[in-house]
Amino acid sequence: EICGPGIDIRNDYQQLKRLENCTVIEGYLHILLISKAEDYRSYRFPKLTVITEYLLLFRVAGLESLGDLFPNLTVIRGWKLFYNYALVIFEMTNLKDIGLYNLRNITRGAIRIEKNADLCYLSTVDWSLILDAVSNNYIVGNKPPKECGDLCPGTMEEKPMCEKTTINNEYNYRCWTTNRCQKMCPSTCGKRACTENNECCHPECLGSCSAPDNDTACVACRHYYYAGVCVPACPPNTYRFEGWRCVDRDFCANILSAESSDSEGFVIHDGECMQECPSGFIRNGSQSMYCIPCEGPCPKVCEEEKKTKTIDSVTSAQMLQGCTIFKGNLLINIRRGNNIASELENFMGLIEVVTGYVKIRHSHALVSLSFLKNLRLILGEEQLEGNYSFYVLDNQNLQQLWDWDHRNLTIKAGKMYFAFNPKLCVSEIYRMEEVTGTKGRQSKGDINTRNNGERASCESDVLHFTSTTTSKNRIIITWHRYRPPDYRDLISFTVYYKEAPFKNVTEYDGQDACGSNSWNMVDVDLPPNKDVEPGILLHGLKPWTQYAVYVKAVTLTMVENDHIRGAKSEILYIRTNASVPSIPLDVLSASNSSSQLIVKWNPPSLPNGNLSYYIVRWQRQPQDGYLYRHNYCSKDKIPIRKYADGTIDIEEVTENPKTEVCGGEKGPCCACPKTEAEKQAEKEEAEYRKVFENFLHNSIFVPRPE
C-alpha cells in the first residue's frame, strides 16, 4: 500500500502503527520528539521498501538501531529534501548503529548524521555505493570512531564475511552492524542492482529485485512505476507523479488537497501531475487542468476587505507578497524602519496595477518610490476628495519618484497632488505628469512649486569621468574638476560604488532615509592644486567583478533663482581585472584499479575570472611500513594512532614519537597555530551548523492546538 503524503510520527511511539501496511511512503517520514525511552523490539515494518522524499530522525529516546524497524528499506528517492538532505539523523541519544542493511540507494540529496553521542558503525559504511556524490555528506559530532571499535561480521574469528572497499585511502570491510554486511553487487552488473544471490536486475530496477533481468520484479524503479512494471518514461496518456509513478488524467483530477489553493485541483503540465502550475505559468481557465505561459509575471489578484490597505511597516507590506494586481487603494505611511527600501521591494515589487488611488504621506523613511518597481497602471476607480488618484504629502526625504527613463506608468483617471516634499525637485514631478498622461489635469495648487524641492539640488550639472584604471582589486578614477559660479561653494566630492553584476542600477537602489544604503560611500577632498583633477583609489575590491560608480559634488546650499545648484556624474560600470582563482573544493581521490586513480573536485568558490582549465599534479609516495606491523584482525592488538592535537597522552603513544626540529629545539612538534583561513573555515562551519539546527527546529516544532 502507498502511504502519504508524508508521515509525521511524534510524541507517542505507538503512532508507529501507522506504518503497518505501508510499502511505499509517498512523501517524507519523520520520527521525532519521543522523549520516553521505549522498547521498540515489537515494532517491525518489513513491508516498507521506499520513501519517495526523505527520512528524518530526531530525538527518539530508546531507539538503538533502525534495522529492526525497517529491515527492507531499500531506496530513499529524495524527490524533495530536508535542507538538501535525504537522510537526517540528529540528536538520537541512544542510537548505536544505523543498521539499514537493505538501504542500497539514495537517489538525490546527501546525508546528515550529527550529534548522536552513541552512534557507531559510521566509518564502516561506504556511502559512495548508496549515493552518487558523497562530498556533501555531513557526519559530525557522533561517537568518536576510536571509542567504537567497529568490527564487521567474522572479523574477530578471522573469517571475514564482508567485502572491502576503499574510502579515503583506507581499504576496509564494509558493514552496517556487527552482524550485517553492506551488500555489494558484482562488478559485472555495473550500475545495475542485484538479487540476494548476486544476479543482475533489470536496468530499470533500483536497489534490488526478486528475480534477475525482470522489470516486474523490482523492489523499486530507477525511473517510473506503472501498472506493476518499471518503465523509463510514462506511457502515453499517463503522467509523472511525485517523481516515481505514472498516473492517468482521472487519477490526477481526483486528488484532493488540504491546501487553501485547492479550489481548482491538480494540473497536468509538461507530462507531470502537480499541485499547481509552475512558476511562469497559469491555468488555462479557472476549471482547467492545463497550464499556459504567463505574459510577464503571473497575475495574482489581492483584495483589501476595507478597500484601503495601509502600508506602515514591513509586516503590513508582507501581506502583498506576490501580488500583481491590487484591488483597492494603497496608503503608504512609512515613518521608520530597517533596510526598508529593499524589504518593501521584496514584498511590493511585483504590483503592476492598483485599481484605486495611491497616497504617500509622512513617509520620512522613503528616499524613492522605486520599490514599486513594476507599477505600470493606477486606474483611479476610487479617488480621494478633490479627485486625486496619486497623492504625495509631507515626505521629508523623498528625492526620486521613479527612474523615468526606464518606467512607463499610466494614471487612467484622477489628478496628482504634491506638497511639502522638500527634497523632491519639481522637475521630477513635471516629468511624471508627462509620463503618466496627467499633464493638464492638475490645477495650479496641485503641484506646489515653493514647498516641493526647496531643500534639494535641483539644477544639476554633469560631472564627467576623465580616466579609469583597474587592477585585480583596485579601481582608480578621476573626473573633471567641477567649477560652480563661486568656487568657494564647492566643499568636496562623494564617490558612491557597489558591486553591480548587471548594468541596471539606479542611484536610489536599496536606499532609505534611515541609514540603509546599498552603495559604499567615500569622501574625496578637493586637490589643493587647482589644475589637478580630483580622483580616488578604491581598494579592497573583488577580482573580476563589475562595479557601478558615480560621483556627487558636495556644495553649499547656494540659492540661485530659488534653486540650489549641484553636480553629479552618470553611473559608470567598470570591471576589476581577473586574478588567481581560490583552490578547488572537495578534492577526493579513489583507486578503481591497480593502475588508476579517479580524482574528483568541485570548482573554486571564488573563480576570480573565467576558468579555462585545471592543472592536476601527482607524485608517487613511499609505502608506509607502519601498516604491516600489526595484525589488524585482532581487536586488542590494534594500536591507537593519535594525531597531533596539541597534547600528547603518554599512555596512548605506542612507539616513540618522531622528533623534529621545531622552533629551534629538538622534541615533539606542537600543533601549528591555526591560520586565519582555518579560523574562518571553523567559524563558517559553526555558522552552518547553527543555520541547519534553526531550520530543523523551525520545520518540526509546531504550537500545541488551543
Epitope: 502507498i2 503524503p5 505501508c22 487519477f251 486528488i255 484532493l256 488537497s257 491546501e259 485547492d262
Partner: nanobody, 123 residues
Amino acid sequence: EVQLVESGGGLVQPGGSLRLSCAASGRTFSSFVMSWFRQAPGKEREFVSAISGSGSRSRYADSVKGRFTISRDNSKNTLYLQMNSLRAEDTAVYYCAANPRRATPDLIQYAYWGQGTLVTVSS
C-alpha cells in the same frame, strides 16, 4: 494529535435518509482532507467519499454517486455525510478519516480514524 468521533448512525428503512457527523479535535481541521469509509460485515473496508480542506472539491465511490453528499463546516470542525435513497447494501460501520496535506484516489492508509458508527438499512 487528531481525535475523530462519528455520530448519527442508526436503523433506517430502504429509500430513507440519514445524516452522519464527525467531530474533530486536536489540530487545525481545515488542514486535513476528510473522508468517509465503510466496512460491511465480513468485507474489507471501502472508500465512500472524500472532501478537500476548503470543502470546495469532493469525490465519491461509484456505488454512492448521486445519493450521498459529503460536506464540512470548518468553523465547527465537523464533517458530514448526507445519505439519501439508502439501500440494504449500504449497511456497514461508517468510519470518518483524516489525512494531512492531501489524499490521492488510491490512498487507504489515512493518518487518523474514528471508532465508527453503525448504519443499518433494513425493512
